[in-house]
């Protein structure tokens, strides 16, 4: 599940938010490492209300959430974390 998502596209996020999103509102998270056309790490969150937001990777709440998800990565994740590798 925790592969790396590489892309040759430029940055996806035109603005980022630090506003906390409760986990129960989150449907999916995608992490895009820096490089390959974008100089910064990007975190994209799909919410259950059919909205999508870029989260500031420096936001404490998302760092905590990602740490929890990494620790649980051996079991079923309540929030899917997508880091698929694109050839």
């Amino acid at each position: 599940v925790l592969e790396v998502y590489y892309t040759s596209l430029r940055c996806r996020c035109v603005q980022e938010s630090s506003v906390f999103i409760p986990r129960r509102f989150i449907d999916r998270i995608q992490i895009l490492p820096r490089g390959n056309g974008c100089p910064r790490k990007e975190i994209i969150v799909w919410k259950k209300n059919k909205s999508i937001v870029c989260v500031d990777p420096q936001a404490e709440w998302i760092q905590r959430m990602m740490e929890v998800l990494r620790k649980r990565s051996s079991s079923t994740l309540p929030v899917p974390v997508f880091k698929r590798k694109i050839p």
């Epitope: 035109v14 603005q15 799909w46 999508i52």
Partner: antibody, heavy 122, light 107 residues
């Protein structure tokens, strides 16, 4: 190449039910993040958002029409549908369907159909 | 619901003029705004997304800006092909709402 095309009755009478079909290609409503919306435009006036339906059958509609409006889809035939019951002359408009894809950057209604003109007249 | 107040409703300008159209949001929409151009007899197409970003294929004479709750579309030097209706859309929350539209004509 993404295309959408609306079809409908053209003309109908007050109190009847309007049924519209959006037939699309170039994307699938089974794909995560895909949605189709309906928007209408009375002649010479502005746009009004009516409803969205998403890949997982989640639906959102305009509260001003919610009691009369139903949105649905047929993924196997790449179609989305809109019905409005008990129509009135105020429902006379060009009706558009448009695609939305939940990707970043998110641009709702990035592709539109050509529109279908609907006239409600007695 | 979020109201989008668009002005002017119509305007006439000369070729080469700088033209600005504004939408004011009744609540904070945090740049969740798109500008659509609709040429006569055609469907709308997105020109500006997230308030300030140019969509693919849009000429650089178009730009978007924000000042508080006011969102503006500016054409730096009007060309004849810019004659169209322009609509703003907020997509911060449902129900999505459009401005009332601006008809831009060439003098």
């Amino acid at each position: 190449q993404v295309t959408l095309k609306e079809s409908g009755p053209g003309i109908l009478q007050p109190s009847q039910t309007l049924s519209l079909t959006c037939t699309f290609s170039g994307f699938s409503l089974t794909t995560y993040g895909m949605g189709v919306g309906w928007i209408r435009q009375p002649s010479g006036k502005g746009l009004e958002w009516l409803a969205n339906i998403w890949w997982d059958d989640d639906k959102y509609s305009n509260p001003s029409l919610q009691s009369r409006l139903t949105i649905s889809k047929d993924t196997s035939n790449n179609q989305a549908f809109l019905t409005i019951t008990n129509v009135d002359t105020a429902d006379t408009a060009t009706y558009y369907c448009a695609r939305s894809e939940l990707v970043m950057p998110y641009v709702p209604f990035d592709y539109w159909g050509q529109g279908v003109r609907v006239t409600v007249s007695s | 619901d979020i109201q989008m107040t668009q002005s002017p409703s119509s305007m006439s300008a000369s070729l080469g003029d700088r033209v600005t159209i504004t939408c004011q949001a009744s609540q904070d929409i945090d740049n969740h705004l798109i500008w659509f151009q609709q040429k006569p007899g055609r469907s709308p197409r997105p020109m500006i997304y997230y308030a300030t970003n140019l969509a693919n294929g849009v000429p650089s004479r178009f730009s978007g800006s924000r000042s508080g709750s006011d969102y503006s579309l500016t054409i730096s030097s009007l060309e004849s092909e810019d004659m169209a209706d322009y609509h703003c859309l907020q997509f911060k929350q449902y129900p999505f709402t459009f401005g009332s539209g601006t008809k831009l004509e060439i003098k």
